[in-house]
Amino acid sequence: LVITPPGPELILNVSSTFVLTCSGSAPVVWERMSQELPQEMAKAQDNTFSSVLTLTNLTGLDTGEYFCTYNDSRGLEPDERKRLYIFVPDPTVGFLPNDAEELFIFLTEITEITIPCRVTDPQLVVTLHEKKGDIALPVPYDHQRGFSGIFEDRSYICKTTIGDREVDSDAYYVYRLQVSSINVSVNAVQTVVRQGENITLMCIVIGNEVVNFEWMYPRKESGRLVEPVTDFLLDMPYHIRSILHIPSAELEDSGTYTCNVTESVNDHQDEKAINITVVESGYVRLLGEVGALQFAELHRSRTLQVVFEAYPPPTVLWFKDNRTLGDSSAGEIALSTRNVSETRYVSELTLVRVKVAEAGHYTMRAFHEDAEVQLSFQLQINVPVRVLELSESHPDSGEQTVRCRGRGMPQPNIIWSACRDLKRCPRELPPMLLGNSSEEESQLETNVTYWEEEQEFEVVSTLRLQHVDRPLSVRCTLRNAVGQDMQEVIVVPHSLPFKEQKLISEEDLGGEQKLISEEDLHHHHHH
């Protein structure tokens, strides 16, 4: 890996722009705080790869470590990752902010730790103090890391002077956890096994040379002893391990397995327990419920999640309308099953930018040789309503009609509202709901059609107005669970000439508003 400029430390000006390049023999990537940064990647003709990181409008908060690493960095050697430290001296930033994990430093033994108070300018003099003390402590400081040394259980702050201003860091809390001199850990290869499979447990003690292990387990209580094997983990000093291996487990081997460790020099002891479950055969069990009807909104992404327990690990398949689903190359569908604990799984179906065609009957099936479970639901795609047409006509009968047509899923709800006093509505006069009196001034007729192919409802509503004696603003509003839409039209009396209709301005759309809903088959007169 080659970084340009090479560093390992750069001091950049605040508000400036700076370009960093990293090249390597495979795809490379710039990272900061374990996150990939926005960057431009390229491949040259000679099969070298590069990534260009452009840092713009730099501030003190850009101070810190930057890493260039190969894109697939699993199992990389340390020299296959290059570190660069950037300082952006910024008088407006005192100490760089820390998250809670950095402010509270827990120890289990006397060991060197770092109090990570860092500044943006490597020229600043930084001192370490007890939280409410003035005396500077004689601890070495590294501008890139902080103060490193062996610290007592206290709280500490760092101080620096920027210009003529003394600046304090957050307080850092150093706390030594009280642990016994023997620290035992017990784990099992599996805590759930089928009868006939093996149970293998390990008990590990750290930091002691001579210890005695004693195991308690269900077989022992019935007098059937198993001889544990004790060994040293050679790659770690004084890590001693005891292995308890029970071949061909029986149902009676279910229960608590305890490892008790004693050390005779100081007469210390510690014990840890773990529960093992032996099952007759494997199982798959759904956890929680998924409703039989699920919803997704058109063009939005939707993740459907199923949680279940299983042993042994199952195969998971998803179906739509009885056809097997797989990750689509176009990235419209993503399937994933995660193992969140030893026997617990979460399977997710993600529909990216949902389409109408994705409505249907979905099934998730989880199975292995011993058991199977399946869960099904219907997915309904919700489509926000839109008013497609609002038109006014004058039939020969003398009445005037306004027709409103719209579509959506679930079924849209229609509300008609009318304004008589165009200048005053809706600013000065509140809307008035129609449907409280019996005088027939208007009639409403609504028809609903479900379009199978588009999987949405169409609503057509016709409002018949008996007596229009002055200009009237009529609004059709459609609503459903995922949205609303409206249109307005101005209805004028028959007597008003066409030219005058055109002269009614937007400002005139005011006055008393009447609401006419689907439920009101009659439109009533208002005072």
């Epitope: 902010p97 820390n98 998250d99 809670a100 994990e101 402010l103 509270f104 827990f106 304090d168 957050d170 307080a171 809390y173 706390y175 956890l177």
Partner: antibody
């Protein structure tokens, strides 16, 4: 200087509402749990509510559940207490305090006390 | 909820006296206990946390002890600045409860 300054107290009628604010300075506000504690006239301290660093976790004393609500704006380094359906017994000086709750260690939750307090703001509920 | 009971409610003492305040929890709280000092018209001040750890800047004449349900705050030699009200406070699963307070006044 590490500082907390409360504001927003005042006289309010029973059933009324109020919003208290607490402005933090001199520390990384977003890294700390925060609490509200109150003290009725001539009485002792009563913890009211607290909230974790990102606002995803809140806890309340039983007597205020459903009426008082704690929130925070990390960008503005501010803590709030929204008070609704106020009663005479809510009359008190309200303090905002920094709550030293470190991230969980193995199975342990450690606690280092409330180390920074504001001067308090007075809420009087009376008709 | 865990109740905290302090005793005595009021304590009269002289400068130089050794003073002990007791705090009892209605159920075990391990050592999750803090002590505060409050003077009239002022905000409380943290003295001790985790039952016995002295907060930075607090004079060493203050000390705390105890675990489970019984805790004590001791002032080894009372100073004029120590006349105040003292509160214990428990911490359990993110809820807190204060004791009713102990007022230390001049004899």
């Amino acid at each position: 200087e590490v500082q907390l300054v409360e504001s927003g107290g005042g006289l309010v009628q029973p059933g009324g509402s109020l919003r208290l604010s607490c402005a933090a300075s001199g520390f990384t506000f977003s890294s700390y749990w925060m609490s509200w504690v109150r003290q009725a006239p001539g009485k002792g301290l009563e913890w009211v509510a607290n909230m974790n660093q990102d606002g995803s976790e809140t806890h309340y004393v039983d007597s205020v559940k459903g009426r008082l609500s704690i929130s925070r704006d990390n960008a503005k380094k501010s803590l709030f207490l929204h008070m609704n359906s106020l009663r005479a017994e809510d009359t008190a000086v309200y303090f905002c305090a920094r709550d030293l709750v470190p991230p969980r260690q193995d199975d342990y939750y450690y606690y280092f006390g409330m180390d920074v307090w504001g001067h308090g703001t007075t809420v009087t509920v009376s008709s | 909820d865990i109740q905290m009971t302090q005793s005595p409610s009021t304590l009269s003492a002289s400068v130089g006296d050794r003073v002990t305040i007791t705090c009892r929890a209605s159920q075990s709280i391990s050592d999750w206990l803090a002590w505060y000092q409050q003077k009239p018209g002022k905000a409380p001040k943290l003295l001790i946390f985790k039952a016995s750890t002295l907060e930075s800047g607090v004079p060493s004449r203050f000390s705390g002890s105890g675990s489970g349900t019984e805790f004590t705050l001791t002032i080894s030699s009372l100073q004029p600045d120590d006349f105040a009200t003292y509160y214990c406070q428990q911490y359990n699963s993110y809820s807190r409860t204060f004791g009713q307070g102990t007022k230390v006044e001049i004899k």
